[in-house]
């Protein structure tokens, strides 16, 4: 029961996490910035992995994709790749984990197969979560580096002067969504791996315990003498003769005070 709960909870947590990773990847608010200010109007900028938007205090909003831009930062491409890999792995993990769920019966699938699938999906969720966390962290680092490196300077360019303007920027909501979602996916993956251990059938050999009558080489199977409950085939407390068979781990057995004579 606990295994099923752990597996189910791991699946749900991972599902929420992957949905969050997808949401973060699609969101425009990876970073926000004040681009322009005067006493009448202010221009805010929010940037995502795929496009950048400007919003003015007047209500005007315009978004533009980066496909028009040459020389995108290599780090941005790396972040995109990490997020997409995270989504793909997470999606495959979800698909695998659906079939691995203990509460779902598919044909005559054995517990060992379900255990293997649970472990596979768990590992996929862990890697997916790590990809998302890494992607978001790389982006945050890129932001901090780029903004602090471009200190206010002025130089002469073609047609006049060029000046880098110092503006205020903040981490966007998508960064926090990505970090939380990555963490949830990671936790879900760990839970699936834990559930896998409980699903795996243990190699347990229930060996018969032999009881010896003193001086005789007779072994009795457990239940040879049953209490008179009226249940079972041996209601008359007859001895069940075993032909002197012994279990392989039992080389020699000595009579004790617990032996039945």
């Amino acid at each position: 029961m606990a295994v099923t709960a752990c597996q189910g909870l791991g699946f749900v947590v991972s599902l929420i996490g992957i949905a969050g990773i997808i949401a973060a990847t699609c969101m425009d608010q990876w970073s926000t910035q004040d681009l322009y200010n005067n006493p009448v109007t202010a221009v805010f900028n929010y940037q995502g992995l795929w496009r950048s938007c400007v919003r003015e205090s007047s209500g005007f909003t315009e978004c533009r994709g980066y496909f028009t831009l040459l020389g995108l930062p290599a780090m941005l491409q790396a972040v995109r790749a990490l997020m997409i890999v995270g989504i793909v792995l997470g999606a495959i993990g979800l698909l695998v984990s659906i079939f691995a769920l203990k509460c779902i019966r598919i044909g005559s699938m054995e517990d060992s197969a379900k255990a293997n699938m649970t472990l596979t999906s768990g590992i996929m969720f862990i890697v997916s979560g790590l990809c998302a966390i890494a992607g978001v962290s790389v982006f945050a680092n890129m932001l901090v580096t780029n903004f602090w490196m471009s200190t206010a300077n002025m130089y002469t360019g073609m047609g006049g002067m060029v000046q880098t303007v110092q503006t205020r920027y903040t981490f966007g909501a998508a960064l926090f969504v990505g970090w939380v979602a990555g963490g949830l996916t990671l936790i879900g993956g760990v839970m699936m791996c834990i559930a896998c251990r409980g699903l795996a059938p243990e190699e347990t050999n229930y060996k018969a315990v032999s009881y010896h009558a003193s001086g005789h080489s007779v072994a009795y199977k457990p239940g040879g003498f049953k209490a008179s409950t009226g249940f079972g085939s041996n209601t008359k407390n007859k001895k069940i003769y075993d032909g002197g068979a012994r279990t392989e781990d039992e080389v020699q057995s000595y009579p004790s005070k617990h032996d039945y004579v």
């Epitope: 322009y36 109007t41 007047s58 005007f60 980066y66 930062p73």
Partner: nanobody
Framework: EVQLVESGGGLVQPGGSLRLSCAAS????????MGWYRQAPGKGRELVAT???????YYADSMKGRSTISRDNAKNTVYLQMNSLKPEDTAVYYC??????????????WGQGTLVTVSS
């Protein structure tokens, strides 16, 4: 790199009108705001008027009511229509463009300046 080409400056009589234009060209992501600044002889550079991409305008008190700023987003051009000019409006007028640079600080580009002389 952004190139700014200013035009429309010259000599004008007091009370006259003048239309300045500034065209931006080159490779850039997006122009956020465009504007005009001026620098009179022996003085610092001061704002005349600015216009954002969405069309919000701002005018300095000295030019309020006497000037109109407009822009053509498709052509990346800004215009400054100045009316009722006074001798104190004599200055070098500079075009200013603020360009968005994704994942970096924005850049301000300045034109070479066009001289406006108000004299009889």
């Amino acid at each position: 790199e952004v190139q700014l080409v200013e035009s429309g400056g010259g000599l004008v009589q007091p009370g006259g009108s003048l239309r300045l234009s500034c065209a931006a060209s080159g490779s850039f992501f997006r122009i956020v705001a465009m504007g005009w600044y001026r620098q009179a002889p022996g003085k610092g550079r001061e704002l005349v008027a600015t216009i954002t991409r969405g069309g919000s305008t701002y005018y300095a008190d000295s030019m309020k009511g006497r000037s109109t700023i407009s822009r053509d987003n498709a052509k990346n051009t800004v215009y400054l229509q100045m009316n009722s000019l006074k001798p104190e409006d004599t200055a070098v007028y500079y075009c200013n463009v603020r360009v968005e640079v994704p994942f970096m600080q924005p850049n301000d580009y300045w034109g070479q300046g066009t001289l406006v002389t108000v004299s009889s």
